[in-house]
Structure formats: structure tokens, C-alpha cells
Interface confidence: low
């Protein structure tokens, strides 16, 4: 089969909105199924027409009623012939129209009176394309070739900019870009002390409005009373909007406040948030833990622990922990310095320890007391010592 595009030059230039008819001549086939292809894809949704010139000579037409820029491309026709695909020479269709924007001015946020640039680019065909800039409803300067960059020395209020592209076919207007003024950020909010220990505090907060400029850091200020002497000031990069305060004094009342900064400067401080560090756990272990075996069980006694530092606060209750060879174990809490142990197996060795607790937690464990299964009583010593008499 012979195949060729007829009635069209290698390059065909058409104005946007105008009709185009491409034709394809096929010889040596009866009623060929002519397929039109554009840029490698079969054209299925456009009008196609077949004209039989003779029994073995057909002309197929591809009719584009009103061409748009998207119709531009490389067209050819193809037919199936004995399992082979015959492909014609291509025709390049160029669609001329008003300029088409490839780059439009983007919204910006800038500091007051700071210089900035806006870009605009449009293409034909036809070329050349010239650009005219608008500031609000005022034209700025004369036409410039595309692409164009507008240099603005600064603005003192939010301002609208757009560009207009011109070629021989007419003009097109870009989107309107709004140039916003950057400002100081708003104060942070929802400030929360998320974790507390005797010397550390974790703080989290939500940033306020960033003033259209990236938040760079936040400052956490700590005092021992609102408005008192600054104990600590920590500057943290953000995000995340969290901070760990270290080296605080146990069992102490503090207040903190937070502010955040962007390139223009810091926000106001948020309101003071009070918090209190936890006290210290007891530093001492109960001494002289001993056991007295009775008919009803085992009585354990130890010496009272006296607070070593005021930060430990009031002490008590005591926590007793015991374990036996058979794996049985238990804990009990008692208010005084004496406990009656029940539920243990006298036939098995017993190891007992005691500690004193406060609001923070338990202090160090006492030396373990070993009560041997054949002892009538026990005494403190290494875990494996046996006492008998």
C-alpha cells in the first residue's frame, strides 16, 4: 500500500479557532481503515472522513473544526496491511494564538520596604511575545520581551501585581499575584508542661500566626516567681515546638513563658505558666532490719528513717519486698517500722528488703535480710548468709 499525506506542507501553521483539514491518500487497498495519530497517540474523538477516489485509492480526512493550542503537534496516518502497520510521513501542525503563560507571577510575603522580584513568561506562536506589568490597576513601565522579571524596591501594604502578554494575535492576562507584608509573629499558645521530674521539665506549645515569615526559633524564659529573676532562658530552633528545661531545683515553684521569632523579630511573650518540680526521693535506706519468729508468723522490724534534706519532704510509708526459693514473691506497704509477714512458706528460705518512700518514690533498698527455713529468726547480711542457733 502506498501512503502519503496530501494537501498539506510539512509544516502547517493555523490560527487558534480556525478549522483544519488534513488528508491522507491510500492506494492499493480496498476500504482501508485509516487511523490518525497525533504525537504517538491514536486520535479517536475527532471527525474522520473517507473519500473513495477509485476502488483501490482512498483519501482519509482528519477534520479539526476549531483548533486550540493543545491540537498542535505531529500528525500522521497509518493503515493495517497484512498484519503490518504502514505509516505516512508526518505533518507538523503549529497553532498560533494569543500568548500562553508558562510562568505567572506567584504570591509572595515580604518585609516592609524590602526589594523583591516577580517573574512572567509567555510563549507563542507567534513570536515575539512582549510583557507588560500591572500594579493594581496601574501599568508599570513599557513592554519588555518575554520572559520578564519585575524588580520592585518594596511595598508598605499588601499589593496586587499581574502581567499581560502581547503578540500579533492579541493579548492574555496572567493570574493576579498578591504580595503580602510580613509581620512579627503572634504569641504562642497552649503552653503545657508535659513531663516533670525533680530537676527537669518538658514544655510544649502551639505557635501563633507566623506573620507570613518562617518561624526560626522560640525562647523559653523561666523564673522562680512570675516577674522575678530570670533563672533560665533557652532558645530552641523550631519545629518541633518543644523544649527540655534541665538543672532545675527539686520541689521548687517556677513560672515559664514562651515567645517565638521570625526574620522580622520576636512575638510578644505568652502568659506565665506556673509549675513545680518534684522533690527528691529518700536518700537513705532503713537500717537494722531484723525478724522475730512467732507462733503466728514472722514479725519484721527496722529503724525509722529520718529525712536528710528538706527537699525529701515527709517520709513514709515503708515498702517491704520479699522473695522465696520457690519463686513466691510479694510486696506490702506499711505505715510504721514493723510488719507482720504472712503467706510465706516456713519450709523455704526467705529474703526480705525494705525501703522508705515519699511523694517522689521509694528510696534505696535496705540490706537484704535472709531468714533460713531452719532459723527461728533472721538477721541482715549478704543474700546467701544463713543464721542459725
Amino acid at each position: 500500500a502506498g501512503l502519503k499525506l496530501m494537501g498539506a506542507p510539512v509544516k502547517l501553521t493555523v490560527s487558534q479557532g480556525q478549522p483544519v483539514k488534513l488528508n491522507c491518500s491510500v492506494e492499493g487497498m480496498e476500504e482501508p481503515d485509516i487511523q490518525w495519530v497525533k504525537d504517538g497517540a491514536v486520535v479517536q474523538n475527532l471527525d474522520q472522513l473517507y473519500i473513495p477516489v477509485s476502488e483501490q485509492h482512498w483519501i482519509g480526512f482528519l477534520s479539526l473544526k476549531s483548533v486550540e493550542r493543545s491540537d498542535a503537534g505531529r500528525y500522521w496516518c497509518q493503515v493495517e496491511d497484512g498484519g503490518e502497520t504502514e505509516i505516512s510521513q508526518p505533518v507538523w501542525l503549529t497553532v498560533e494564538g494569543v500568548p500562553f503563560f508558562t510562568v505567572e507571577p506567584k504570591d509572595l510575603a515580604v518585609p516592609p520596604n524590602a526589594p523583591f522580584q516577580l517573574s512572567c513568561e509567555a510563549v507563542g506562536p507567534p513570536e515575539p511575545v512582549t510583557i507588560v506589568w500591572w500594579r493594581g490597576t496601574t501599568k508599570i513601565g513599557g513592554p519588555a520581551p518575554s520572559p520578564s522579571v519585575l524588580n520592585v524596591t518594596g511595598v508598605t501594604q499588601s499589593t496586587m501585581f499581574s502581567c499581560e502578554a502581547h503578540n500579533l494575535k492579541g493579548l492574555a492576562s496572567s493570574r493576579t499575584a498578591t504580595v503580602h507584608l510580613q509581620a512579627l509573629p503572634a504569641a504562642p499558645f497552649n503552653i503545657t508542661v508535659t513531663k516533670l521530674s525533680s530537676s527537669n521539665a518538658s514544655v510544649a506549645w502551639m505557635p501563633g500566626a507566623d506573620g507570613r515569615a518562617l518561624l526560626q526559633s522560640c525562647t523559653v524564659q523561666v523564673t522562680q516567681a512570675p516577674g522575678g529573676w530570670e533563672v533560665l532562658a533557652v532558645v530552641v530552633p523550631v519545629p518541633p515546638f518543644t523544649c527540655l528545661l534541665r538543672d532545675l531545683v527539686p520541689a521548687t515553684n517556677y513560672s515559664l513563658r514562651v515567645r517565638c521569632a521570625n526574620a522580622l523579630g520576636p512575638s510578644p511573650y505568652a502568659d506565665w505558666v506556673p509549675f513545680q518540680t518534684k522533690g527528691l526521693a529518700p536518700a537513705s535506706a532503713p537500717q537494722n532490719l531484723h525478724a522475730i519468729r512467732t507462733d503466728s508468723g514472722l514479725i519484721l522490724e527496722w529503724e525509722e528513717v529520718i529525712p536528710e534534706a528538706p527537699l525529701e519532704g515527709p517520709l513514709g510509708p515503708y515498702k517491704l519486698s520479699w522473695v522465696q526459693d520457690n519463686g513466691t514473691q510479694d510486696e506490702l506497704t506499711v505505715e510504721g517500722t514493723r510488719a507482720n509477714l504472712t503467706g510465706w512458706d516456713p519450709q523455704k528460705d526467705l529474703i526480705v528488703r525494705v525501703c522508705v518512700s515519699n511523694a517522689v518514690g521509694c528510696g534505696p533498698w535496705s540490706q537484704p535480710l535472709v531468714v533460713s527455713s531452719h532459723d527461728r529468726a533472721g538477721q541482715q547480711g549478704p543474700p546467701h548468709s544463713r543464721t542459725s542457733w
Epitope: 509544516k11 504525537d39 497517540a41 498542535a72 503537534g73 505531529r74 502497520t85 505509516i87 508526518p90 507538523w92
Partner: antibody, heavy 125, light 108 residues
Amino acid sequence: EVQLVQSGADVKKPGASLTISCQASGYTFTDYWISWVRQKPGKGLEWMGRISRHGSQTYYGPSFQGHVTISADRSTATAYLQWRSLEASDTAMYYCVRAGGQTSGGTIPEYYQHWGPGTLVTVSS
Amino acid sequence: SYELTQPPSVSVSPGQTARITCSGDALPKKYAYWYQQKSGQAPVLVIYEDHKRASGIPERFSGSSSGTMATLTISGAQVEDEADYYCYSISPAGNYGVFGGGTKLTVL
């Protein structure tokens, strides 16, 4: 003057992703197709694929279908060749080529007159 | 997949005629193109559409095609013609391109 400027040589580990680029100048980017050609060290040329002038249509050689992605950015007149997961066998020089040339007989798509300098990709663990 | 077959090497003396062949089932319906690649350089188009010389290519280079065979001929080969030569065409369905395996031309 037609110029195809390719990105620099790259060394990657197997399994890594990679995108190499080819920036065209000296002609209207959307008037021509861009093809990519591979050449392994000491071996012959292999046609990898081609992207249409407007970036809407891509063709791939059977050996490369599904392994690489060809794309283009009309605004920067740049074509790209991308791998999601490199293999040691991808070690090669990669050329981008302007596909299509104007001749007395018309525009010939497979007229590969303008070649980039090549990008050497080395994939090694 | 579609293949184009070339001889791995061809040797000629300076001034002699070198012929490099390329065979492929679709060559009766598809054009052949020839590319020259010198060591360490990008390929250069020599012949397009079977027999047309690309711009800037000396007249001693010519191409022909008959049936399933395309041929690149260098009449009066010169030392500077020593290079790898690749034929190129498109698949029978026209949906992908194919290079031949390449022929190393040695001009002794």
C-alpha cells in the same frame, strides 16, 4: 547552535534511585522529540526510549519498559531519565539525543544529529 | 524483540572500499540510519533514510538498502574513518528504536 547539556557523572549503590537530566538550548524544545541511548562500558549503543515534543507521549524499548521513566519539563527545556531502583547492570554512559531533523525531504523523526556529551552512571556496592 | 544484525568487525587498507552491512526483517519497510562513533566521543549521524548523507559528512560515505539488508559504503577509506559504526532503525510496529550491535572498522 543546538546544545544538549547533561548532568554530571554519578556513583550510586544498588537499589538507589537516580534522575539524570538533559537541558536543551539553541532551538525550540517543543519542536523535537528527545531520545535516550545507553552505552555500557566497551559495548554498543542501545535505544532506551523517546519522549514527545510536548511530553505527553513516551515510547520505551522492550528492555527498558518499567525500569526507567522518561519525562520532560517544557518550561525549562529539560528532559529527564529516572530510575526508582538501580542495578549494577545499569552502569553505563547515557546519552540524550534530539530526535528529529529538518531535511530537504521534510522533518524526519529518527534523524539523530544532535547528541549530548553523555552522563556516566556507575552503580556499585 | 526486534534485532538488527551487523558484523562485529571490518578491516580495510587505506584507500580501499569498506562495506558494513545491517540486516533486519523490517528494513524493507523501515528506513536505516548510520552512526559513527569514535573512541570516547558521542555518535555522529552519517546516513539517514537509507541513502541520504547528513550535513558535513564527506562524499566517500554512501548508503543503500535492498530488501532486509542496508549497507554503509566508505569509498576510499581513510585512517580517520576508523571508528565503530552502528545502524539504526525502528521496530516493525514503529513503537521503539533499535541499534545494531555495531561494527568496528579498522583502517590498517
